[in-house]
């Protein structure tokens, strides 16, 4: 099954793909496409390299690494929910049935909602403690403005403190939400 990678709406997504050139600069054609790897090439090609250079790309898709050293990892800029799905990295290695084909699943999550700035001071003043979360790397860590992130183990305590309080009403009125997971 496909390896899964995650990013949030508005962020850049990173899909890793590597090979080792037989010699420095001795490159092989690589394609990236949306959809699982088919028999020929890639489906719905978004980027392609040849033995010398990137010879085709579409907006928002680029190679951030040094592809001349075999780092053909794909960066997708400013992702939206529509970018979710399977991506194919195909490395067309010389020889009989030698192609390396990787299907990578990209999951895009909605961006966390930031409360209105006018209410931010109230919230941080009421809860000055430092709360942190750990995600699966930079793409998973998102801070709500200058607000502290909320550890999942502290959700129930925080909910109890908010219940029936004026702050809860203020927070609701401002349209802010707390997303879990």
């Amino acid at each position: 099954s496909e390896v899964e990678y995650r990013a949030e709406v508005g962020q850049n997504a990173y899909l890793p793909c590597f090979y080792t050139p037989a010699a420095p600069g001795n490159l092989v054609p690589v394609c990236w496409g949306k959809g699982a790897c088919p028999v020929f090439e890639c489906g719905n090609v978004v980027l392609r390299t040849d033995e010398r250079d990137v010879n085709y790309w579409t907006s928002r898709y680029w190679l951030n690494g040094d592809f001349r050293k075999g780092d053909v990892s794909l960066t997708i800029e400013n992702v939206t929910l529509a970018d979710s799905g399977i991506y194919c990295c195909r490395i067309q290695i010389p020889g009989i049935m030698n192609d390396e084909k990787f299907n990578l699943k990209l999951v895009i999550k909605p961006a966390k909602v930031t409360p209105a700035p006018t209410r931010q001071r109230d919230f941080t003043a009421a809860f000055p403690r430092m709360l942190t979360t750990r995600g699966h790397g930079p793409a998973e860590t998102q801070t709500l403005g200058s607000l502290p992130d909320i550890n999942l183990t502290q959700i129930s305590t925080l909910a109890n403190e908010l219940r029936d309080s004026r702050l809860a009403n203020d927070l609701r009125d401002s349209g802010a939400t707390i997303r879990i997971g």
């Epitope: 054609p29 088919p38 028999v39 020929f40 489906g43 392609r48 040849d50 010879n55 020889g95």
Partner: antibody, heavy 120, light 107 residues
């Protein structure tokens, strides 16, 4: 406009090797995006993909024929080749060379086909 | 290998009529399905690729639809030159395989 032309003997004896040449004109065999392929069609029947070679040197063979088939290329002559060893009557077919263009709007180019009969 | 089953085996229609051809795959081929047309004594010609995209130079009366395992080729109004054998072909999994063909003949 890419054009392809098959050539080779129309009659091969059982247990021998079938050898065909495809000559490409109107395009370079070393260009990216073209999958240079061999496909065959048994008399009155459906189509069977034998294999392809890509300009990178990537080669794929149909598993049902893999132990007997070789596809190669000579870029200086702009030709690619099919060899099928240990043939039997079941290999009697029209053999097509074809090119599938997969960059941009997909298109294909085929030779007119050559009938190869395996018989003693 | 993926088996493609086409139906009907033969379709008898008159010029100007609509033709609907079906292709079913033994497992999902996503949208990686093509349709070819073959006339007697000629090589096949690619009509549709990736289920619904017309190949270069193919008239608009040819259209394809479907995904996964069930696909349809529609010829909206048959022209005399459309009477031929039609094959579906998958490129999802190696080796690429073809259906057994549907013959569209003049009624």
């Amino acid at each position: 406009q890419v054009q392809l032309q098959e050539s080779g003997p129309g009659l091969v004896k059982p247990s021998q090797t079938l050898s065909l040449t495809c000559t490409v004109s109107g395009g370079s065999i070393s260009s990216g995006g073209y999958y240079w392929s061999w496909i065959r069609q048994h008399p009155g029947k459906g189509l069977e993909w034998i294999g392809y070679i890509y300009y990178s040197g990537s080669i794929y063979y149909n598993p049902s024929l893999k132990s007997r088939v070789t596809i190669s290329v000579d870029t200086s002559k702009n030709q690619f080749y099919l060899k099928l060893s240990s043939v039997t009557a079941a290999d009697t077919a029209v053999y097509y060379c074809a090119s599938l263009m997969v960059w941009g709007v997909m298109g294909d180019y085929w030779g007119q086909g050559t009938l190869v009969t395996v018989s003693s | 290998e993926i088996v493609l089953t086409q139906s009907p085996a033969t379709l008898s229609l008159s010029p100007g009529e609509r033709a609907t051809l079906s292709c079913r795959a033994s497992q999902s081929v996503s949208s990686y399905l093509a349709w070819y047309q073959q006339k007697p004594g000629q090589a096949p010609r690619l009509l549709i690729y990736d289920a619904s995209n017309r190949a270069t130079g193919i008239p608009a009366r040819f259209s394809g639809s479907g995904s996964g395992t069930d696909f349809t080729l529609t010829i909206s109004s048959l022209e005399p030159e459309d009477f031929a054998v039609y094959y579906c072909q998958q490129r999802s999994d190696w080796p690429p395989t073809f259906g057994q063909g549907t013959k569209v003949e003049i009624k």
